[in-house]
């Protein structure tokens, strides 16, 4: 689900699940700004004080990262010039479970959308030849 | 075949206007922004301008901005550049190239003389 | 607008050389940086994206290094497909800018 609007622009995420100890990937996209300087991307979740993660004027920031994610978070920033702003979340914990917010700036306006993380032991399909 | 293949270059005028197209295949256009870039004769590469996928973004550089306009229709698989009050200096070789992380398609170009 | 400029603006070489061309921004444009290669007549190719990422169906003995302003091409055994004009561009900004180009010709 995303938003869209005048003076808004529309960001669109995935709902997804993370395997605990392995990494994963929270998605977001957006129409990409050519304009690299002007790309803010601020992933927030519900409860915690801190951010996520932050990226702005084509670096990370995290100098208001949240502690429980110190160490554990980036984004693709080869990638933020075609509209990903995926985040990255290493060693998955089951305290990673919840809703994520994908706060995005561009020169045109801001937008966001809300995803759900579900964290588990989830075991890979079996596939009986 | 991922293809871009530019067209609408010729012989104009100072003052005239033409109309260029850049007709893309091969890949999924309405999901890439898309840049205009020119080369005049013996010289360097020189960025004119960008869009974004849906056309949210536009972009011009200073030497063409209010005579220049960008545009895409993503129902036609097709880039536009449209030059008007032309100059003997926007004569050059004009090129469309897909935005990824680089240019990383480009056109054959597309010649504009602009000349009395 | 953010300055970029290449040296040299020409240089000889001969087949096997290791080949090395700068490009410095006029301020940090992070790793957002491009190399493109340009034959006469032809349209440019990218060569390297995001200042050392190998472009798809580009030979490795091209690389990339650098961030910030400071940037570098390599080409690690010059082949004869080589001798060509080569651009950097950055695109962490508008108005997007090219540098001036090199020129690498056969000694």
């Known amino acids: 689900f995303g938003i869209s609007g005048r003076h808004s622009i529309t960001v669109t995420t995935v709902a997804s699940a993370g395997n605990i100890g392995e990494d994963g990937i929270l998605s977001c996209t957006f129409e990409p700004d050519i304009k690299l300087s002007d790309i803010v991307i601020q992933w927030l979740k519900e409860g915690v004080l801190g951010l996520v993660h932050e990226f702005k004027e084509g670096k990370d920031e995290l100098s208001e990262q949240d502690e429980m994610f110190r160490g554990r978070t980036a984004v693709f920033a080869d990638q933020v010039i075609v509209g990903n702003a995926s985040l990255r979340l290493k060693n998955v914990q089951l305290t990673d479970a919840g809703t994520y917010k994908c706060y995005i700036i561009t020169s045109k306006g801001k937008g966001n959308a809300n995803l759900e993380y579900k964290t588990g032991a989830f075991s890979m399909p079996e596939v009986n030849v | 075949e991922v293809q871009l293949l530019e067209s609408g270059g010729g012989l104009v005028q100072p003052g005239g206007s033409l109309r260029l197209s850049c007709a893309a295949s091969?890949?999924?256009?309405?999901?890439?922004?898309m840049h205009w870039v020119r080369q005049a004769p013996g010289k360097g590469l020189e960025w004119v301008a960008s869009?974004?996928?849906?056309?949210?973004?536009?972009y011009y550089a200073d030497s063409v901005k209010g005579r220049f306009t960008i545009s895409r229709d993503n129902s036609k698989n097709t880039l536009y550049l449209q030059m008007n009050s032309l100059r003997a200096e926007d004569t050059a070789v004009y090129y469309c190239?897909?935005?990824?992380?680089?240019?990383?398609?480009w056109g054959q170009g597309t010649t504009v003389t602009v000349s009395s | 607008d953010i300055q970029m400029t290449q040296s040299p603006s020409s240089l000889s070489a001969s087949v096997g050389d290791r080949v090395t061309i700068t490009c410095r921004a006029s301020?940090?444009?992070?790793?957002?940086l491009n190399w493109y290669q340009q034959k006469p007549g032809k349209a440019p190719k990218l060569l390297i994206y995001y200042a050392s990422s190998l472009q798809s169906g580009v030979p490795s003995r091209f690389s990339g290094s650098g961030s910030g302003t400071d940037f570098t091409l390599t080409i690690s055994s010059l082949q004869p497909e080589d001798f060509a004009t080569y651009y950097c561009q950055q695109y962490y900004s508008t108005p997007l800018t090219f540098g001036q180009g090199t020129k690498v010709e056969i000694k």
């Open positions: 301020q940090s444009i992070r790793s957002y």
């Open positions: 091969g890949f999924t256009f309405s999901s890439y922004g």
């Open positions: 869009i974004s996928s849906s056309s949210g973004y536009i």
């Open positions: 190239a897909r935005a990824s992380s680089g240019m990383d398609v």
